[in-house]
């Protein structure tokens, strides 16, 4: 049951009648197989649903797929399978939806083995019409749209060719052979790795990184001895094999690969990996795997150049086997990230940072919860959040943590309260302040979603039995109402709402099972009549993000500035509306040493905010010293934290030191010490 589901709760009047008038059922006329759903464009109301049904026969697999379209947010669907000539669509490629509101859709068809190439169906009018196009190659990946121009597509073929189209898939040209990985960069640039000898796998570590800025007319080799590459924010990363051994290091470029700098990060061996956890135009979170099959590594955060890294979090959980990490960007509040660490006793604990990785702490225990059996002290424990790792371990966790940029401060997640993550059935917790404080929102596991920028939260109990009840809250999860959306319960498979959390419609997907058949069914509920009026000024209140000490003038300062938001009052039952824009008022803070990170060759001693020169350079610091670019070795010891906007206050600038003379080591030959590599 839901906390607060009682008479004292602020109940919405006559909600059953209001919702009953706005509940739309659609039964899909096909056998149950798999279903995939895509939204086409933003605020268009257009949804495409692809159902596929496989019958494995002795010799081959017989498949059937159907395509449905809605233009009213899922209230009604029309079977448009005839628009794609009743062709079987390959679900592993999904539906390739164009960027922004381009209205473009590409579906990749299943073709018989002997055909010269694949087949696609293209639409540029929000799936009203489709054009069939036969391809001169068999696609290995989904078509990738250029973020800048939705007419430009790229795809890899099963024979490792890189194919490009300049007219939205009408004509295709192979611009390079022997390609392993290709990605769009900015300004219609394509980056890709190629192999020279055997194959992608055989040449791993000996690949070349190429760039084309004119869709394949001309090329530039921008890296050799490449293991892999990645793009994050304005940074281009490549892991490059070392000359002497089988280790590799990260190199970074901020000019599309024209010039590279070695990142001051540990090198990794064959069995280890690097992973970009998050990146924006200011900085990067990088995970570096620990040697051995430990299942953990270290998070480092970068400076504004992506070159100098500070250790952010030890023993960060990231399984090598399944590639699972709980690292989550809390998009509803700037600077907040949540992840899991593997403690010495092999228990998993949740950590949170409010300052972009500067400091990590445990989550505060919710006031209305007691510590579970994992807690040594029944009065002192923390909230631990279930995310990707718990889901991969098949714990009773139907959903990862949820936050939305336009539902300021709201975070919803499954969790348990103790000294570590518990394998017991979790409850659902909510934070309304970006993760500083938490409250139990619902008992037991649930599916949940945010509508109308936080004005409504919807939840459905996770159950193995058929369901017919949905819960909703208009006060950020304090009080819940239940609505029976159908007399005949369905086997629930998922909640679907338009990405961006601006919609007031929710679709409940599931299937009905009778003696002979099972059919897909959706119920779309429009909450517009629950939120009868538009919100006015009086419905909003001011909230200072990151506030921990009202007495302190610097209260709320993160990365050199604080932000006051206008937020909907919990008791206001009104529509934020589709055009709602988060209102925030930033104010600049005075600088303190906390606004600076230690530059290369400097470190912060325990419990000290000053950066102190390292007495000697060892390990990866020494390697950076030897192979890094000379201009990066001249420093005053401090660099402003990326994105920090502070002004005035402390200015820790001091004399500039040249650290080149420290670049010596008994372990390196004299000639290495004299030569500099850029």
């Amino acid at each position: 049951s839901a906390p607060g589901e009682d008479e004292e709760c602020g109940r919405v009047r006559d909600f059953v009648a209001k919702l009953a008038n706005n509940t739309h059922q659609h039964v899909f006329d096909d056998l149950r197989g798999s279903v995939s759903l895509s939204w086409v464009g933003d605020s268009t109301g257009v949804i495409l649903v692809l159902t596929t049904f496989h019958v494995p026969l002795v010799i081959m697999t017989f498949g059937q797929s159907k395509l449905y379209r809605s233009e009213d947010y899922g209230k009604n669907f029309k079977d448009i399978t005839d628009l794609i000539n009743n062709t079987f669509i390959r679900t592993e490629f999904g539906m390739a939806i164009g960027p922004e509101n381009s209205g473009k859709v590409v579906l990749t068809a299943e073709v018989s083995g002997g055909s010269r190439g694949g087949r696609i169906f293209r639409s540029s009018d929000f799936a009203k019409n489709f054009v069939q196009t036969d391809l001169p190659f068999h696609p290995l990946t989904q078509m990738m749209y250029s973020p800048q121009n939705s007419d430009y597509l790229l795809a890899l073929s099963t024979e490792n060719g890189l194919w490009v189209s300049k007219n939205f898939g009408g004509k295709w040209e192979e611009i390079h052979k022997a390609v392993c990985l290709a990605k769009w960069g900015s300004d219609n640039t394509i980056f890709f790795t190629t192999y020279a000898n055997g194959s992608c796998k055989a040449d791993l570590g000996a690949l070349e990184l190429w760039r084309t800025s004119d869709l394949g007319k001309s090329f530039k080799t921008i890296g050799v001895k490449i293991y892999s590459f990645g793009l994050g924010g304005r940074f281009l990363f490549a892991s490059v094999m070392a000359d002497k051994d089988t280790t590799r290091r990260i190199h970074v470029s901020t000019d599309q690969g024209d010039t590279w700098s070695m990142a001051q990060l540990p090198s990794v061996g064959q069995e280890q990996f690097y992973s970009i956890l998050a990146a924006n135009d200011d900085m990067v979170f990088m995970h570096v795997d620990e040697p051995g099959d430990t299942g953990f590594g270290t998070i480092f955060t970068s400076d504004d150049r992506g070159i100098v890294y500070s250790k952010s979090l030890d023993r960060h959980l990231y399984t090598t086997t399944g590639g699972e990490t709980d690292f989550t960007n809390v998009t509803s509040l700037r600077g907040v990230y949540i992840t899991s660490v593997l403690s010495e006793d092999n228990s998993i604990q949740t950590m949170i940072t409010f300052d972009q990785g500067g400091r990590w702490t445990h989550l505060r225990k919710p006031e209305n919860s007691e510590c579970d059996a994992t807690a040594k002290n029944k009065n002192e424990c923390s909230l631990h959040i279930h995310a990707s790792y718990s889901i991969s371990q098949k714990l009773n966790v139907p959903m990862a943590p949820l936050s939305e940029p336009n539902a300021v401060g709201i975070v919803i997640a499954h969790g348990s309260v103790g000294d570590a993550i518990s394998v017991m059935v979790p409850d659902v917790y909510i934070s309304d302040d970006g993760g500083y404080s938490w409250t139990k929102m619902l008992e037991g596991p649930h599916y949940y979603t945010i509508l109308d920028s936080g004005g409504i939260i919807v939840a459905i109990e996770h159950s193995s039995r058929p369901i017919n009840v949905i819960k909703f809250s208009t006060d950020e999860g304090q009080c819940w109402q239940t609505y029976t959306f159908t007399r005949d319960p369905i086997y629930f498979t998922g909640l679907a709402s338009e990405p961006g959390a601006r919609s007031m419609n929710i679709s409940i997907w599931g299937f009905t099972e009778s003696f002979l058949t099972s059919q897909w069914v959706s119920y779309t509920i429009d909450f517009k009549d629950i939120l009868e009026r538009n919100c006015e000024e009086k419905d909003y209140t001011i909230w200072l993000a990151h506030s921990t000490d009202p007495e302190d003038y610097e209260d709320g300062c993160i990365a050199g500035y604080k932000e006051q938001f206008l937020r909907l009052r919990k008791s206001s039952v009104c529509q934020n509306g589709r055009d709602y824009v988060v209102t925030k008022q930033p104010s600049i803070c005075l600088c303190s040493l906390e606004d600076f990170l230690c530059d290369f060759g400097y470190y912060r001693p325990e419990n000290d905010s000053k950066c102190v020169e390292q007495p000697e350079l060892k390990g990866h610091d020494l390697e950076f010293c030897l192979y890094g670019r000379e201009e990066h070795l001249t420093t005053n010891g401090y660099r402003k934290i990326p994105g920090d906007k502070c002004q005035g206050g402390v200015n820790p600038v001091r004399e500039v030191k040249d650290l080149k003379k420290k670049c010596t080591s008994n372990f390196l030959s004299p000639e290495k010490q004299n030569s500099k590599s850029n």
Epitope: C9, G10, R11, D433, Y436, S437, D475, Q478, K538, D539, T541, I542, W543, L544, A545, H546, S547, T548, P550, E551, D552, Y553, D555, G556, Q564, R569, K570, S571, S572, Q585, S587
Partner: antibody, heavy 124, light 107 residues
Framework: QVQLVQSGAEVKKPGASVKVSCKAS????????MHWVRQAPGQGLEWMGW????????RYAQKFQGRVTMTRDTSISTAYMELSRLRSDDTAVYYC?????????????????WGQGTTVTVSS | DIQMTQSPSSLSASVGDRVTITCRAS??????LNWYQQKPGKAPKLLIY???SLQSGVPSRFSGSGSGTDFTLTISSLQPEDFATYYC?????????FGGGTKVEIK
């Protein structure tokens, strides 16, 4: 210690204006809302509005809209409330009160520090 | 505007008595309800905020409960200094509104 000190009693004629000051000390002035509440003789409490000293933003009760102006001078940690076009039923004790804050929320947690009150008498 | 109705408007009680004052909002105000004590010629004093949180420095004999529309202020054992007028106030929806007050007198 935290305190709010208000200006002295005022006697005004109908149609005139009155400006009451409220000097804050012992805390960060810009970090808390300042509310103004009045109490007519023998009556209950009536909220007039608030000012956010940090931004200068205000919100007034509908009843006083157009007649009340709330301002602040952060350099001397002082809030002001000016009421114009005075009538005899504006005779009351006027209080400034600091809005209690909780984890970033500026409203909703009551008024935890009050001034001593300023008596305004409107009489012809 | 949200109307706040306090009851009773006055009550007589003796030292040591348990006293209960109720406050009803004309619509749900979640838990944004505060209680004040006012003595003659003095400014009000915050006792309880957010329906049930005790303001620092206030004796623990004062307690608050409720959420939504119905709220209660309880004085578990009335003391001589508790004879005063008590006001509830909602701070959830603008304009902020106060109840009419409950005067607690000596029996």
């Amino acid at each position: 210690q935290v305190q709010l000190v208000q200006s002295g009693a005022e006697v005004k004629k109908p149609g005139a204006s009155v400006k009451v000051s409220c000097k804050a000390s012992g805390y960060t002035f810009v970090a808390y809302y300042m509310h103004w509440v009045r109490q007519a003789p023998g009556q209950g409490l009536e909220w007039m509005g608030w000012i956010n000293p940090n931004s200068g933003a205000t919100r007034y009760a509908q009843k006083f809209q157009g007649r009340v102006t709330m301002t602040r001078d952060t350099s001397i940690s002082t809030a002001y409330m000016e009421l114009s076009r005075l009538r005899s039923d504006d005779t009351a004790v006027y209080y400034c009160a600091r809005g209690k804050r909780s984890s970033g929320w500026y409203e909703g947690y009551g008024m935890d520090v009050w001034g001593q009150g300023t008596t305004v008498t409107v009489s012809s | 505007d949200i109307q706040m109705t306090q009851s009773p408007s006055s009550l007589s009680a003796s030292v040591g008595d348990r006293v209960t004052i109720t406050c009803r909002a004309s619509q749900s105000i979640s838990s944004y309800l505060n209680w004040y004590q006012q003595k003659p010629g003095k400014a009000p004093k915050l006792l309880i905020y957010a329906a049930s949180s005790l303001q620092s420095g206030v004796p623990s004999r004062f307690s608050g409960s409720g959420s939504g529309t119905d709220f209660t202020l309880t004085i578990s054992s009335l003391q001589p200094e508790d004879f005063a007028t008590y006001y509830c106030q909602q701070s959830d929806v603008s304009p902020i509104t106060f109840g009419g007050g409950t005067k607690v007198e000596i029996k």
